[in-house]
């Protein structure tokens, strides 16, 4: 990996062992200033593999609300607006990092957690398996 | 929101004001035990709106490596395997949280940062705008 020279102004950390505890400032910096969220907001409806968004809430997690995509159909929407079962709508999944309160119900102590979320759906050619 | 009773065994936190600093254990807990990653790994190639994955590396960020999807075509792949420009391939984007080293180059001090990543692509019906 890349070795980074340590900044002499870094805060001290007592525990140098893994699992290591670090300090995190929760005042979120948003890098998404030049994006237009309106543009992609209706893709879930206009896609040939449309999806619904379901709210997943967990007060022990940060962020507490995550939206999960569920494909509306097994097939994909064709040019006539009908479901075509020769193709399949499948969820596009991504692993994301969240903070889990640990110990539970603590406002200032967390553990990093990796979760898999479905972000949207795409239309794919199914793989054919010949079974006995 | 939901009020959670505070666990009496929580670590003390000096600063009760925002921006608040919390302790985070970086020993990641992986919740994705019952998923089959093989199933979705080739969707980028089999989709009617295929995409390429580009590696984005930043040693000042945690995770340092993030994969960004870029749609291969403006149009979508039709049943004959040709690009159909009546439809459009568009990226599905998601806001994710990452940790940004702050001050820079510090191994144990971070700030939460929100970034927008393209996870994959989907095929949509373009909106027609009539302009003068």
């Amino acid at each position: 990996g890349i070795t980074i020279p340590r900044n002499p102004g870094c805060p001290n950390s007592e525990d140098k062992n893994f699992p290591r505890t670090v300090m995190v400032n929760l005042n979120i910096h948003n890098r998404n200033t030049n994006t237009n969220p309106k543009r992609s907001s209706d893709y879930y409806n206009r896609s040939t593999s449309p999806w619904n968004l379901h709210r997943n809430e967990d007060p022990e997690r940060y962020p507490s609300v995550i939206w999960e995509a569920k494909c509306r159909h097994l097939g994909c929407i064709n040019a006539d607006g009908n479901v075509d079962y020769h193709m399949n709508s499948v969820p596009i999944q991504q692993e994301i990092l969240v903070l889990r309160r640990e110990p539970p119900h603590c406002p200032n102590s967390f553990r990093l957690e990796k979760i898999l979320v479905s972000v949207g759906c795409t239309c794919v050619t199914p793989i054919v398996h010949h079974v006995a | 929101g939901i009020t959670i009773p505070r666990n009496p065994g929580c670590p003390n936190s000096e600063d009760k004001n925002f921006p608040r600093t919390v302790m985070v254990n970086l020993n990641i807990h992986n919740r994705n035990t019952n998923t089959n990653p093989k199933r979705s790994s080739d969707y980028y190639n089999r989709s009617t709106s295929p995409w390429n994955l580009h590696r984005n590396e930043d040693p000042e960020r945690y995770p340092s490596v993030i994969w960004e999807a870029k749609c291969r075509h403006l149009g979508c792949i039709n049943a004959d395997g040709n690009v159909d420009y009546h439809m459009n391939s568009v990226p599905i984007q998601q806001e994710i949280l990452v940790l940004r080293r702050e001050p820079p180059h510090c191994p144990n001090s971070f700030r939460l940062e929100k970034i927008l990543v393209s996870v994959g692509c989907t095929c949509v019906t373009p909106i027609v705008h009539h302009v003068a």
């Epitope: 494909c71 097994l74 079974v131 | 199933r39």
Partner: nanobody
Framework: QVQLVQSGGGLVQTGGSLRLSCSVS????????MGWYRQVPGRQRELVAM????????YYADSVKDRFTISRINANNTIHLQMNNLKPEDTAIYYC?????????MGQGTQVTVSS
């Protein structure tokens, strides 16, 4: 691992009827479907009929609408294809299929021959 067992088929006169059956076992998700494809040698595989595992939604190819009926017995994941008013052009190998999102599992196939 998905397993499919299909039965039925055979030789029938034009205008006659046949019933195909198929049962599936293994990993079945709520967003899946079962049905039949058919294939004539040298021609492309055709989706004949399909039924959604949980919703019960059905799909029929235009060529078989009002003649074929697909039904499902939920308890043991068995489907039936009732084929009435059969025509010579229905002659083909019929494959039972189980469709999970992104994956299509096909059975061993059964011959249906309609003689004129």
């Amino acid at each position: 691992q998905v397993q499919l067992v299909q039965s039925g088929g055979g030789l029938v006169q034009t205008g006659g009827s046949l019933r195909l059956s198929c049962s599936v076992s293994g990993d079945i998700s709520s967003q899946s479907a079962m049905g039949w494809y058919r294939q004539v040698p040298g021609r492309q595989r055709e989706l004949v009929a399909m039924i959604h595992t949980t919703k019960g939604d059905t799909y029929y190819a235009d060529s078989v609408k009002d003649r074929f009926t697909i039904s499902r017995i939920n308890a043991n994941n068995t489907i039936h294809l009732q084929m009435n008013n059969l025509k010579p052009e229905d002659t083909a190998i019929y494959y039972c299929t189980h469709n999970e999102p992104g994956d299509l599992y096909m059975g061993q196939g059964t011959q249906v021959t309609v003689s004129s």
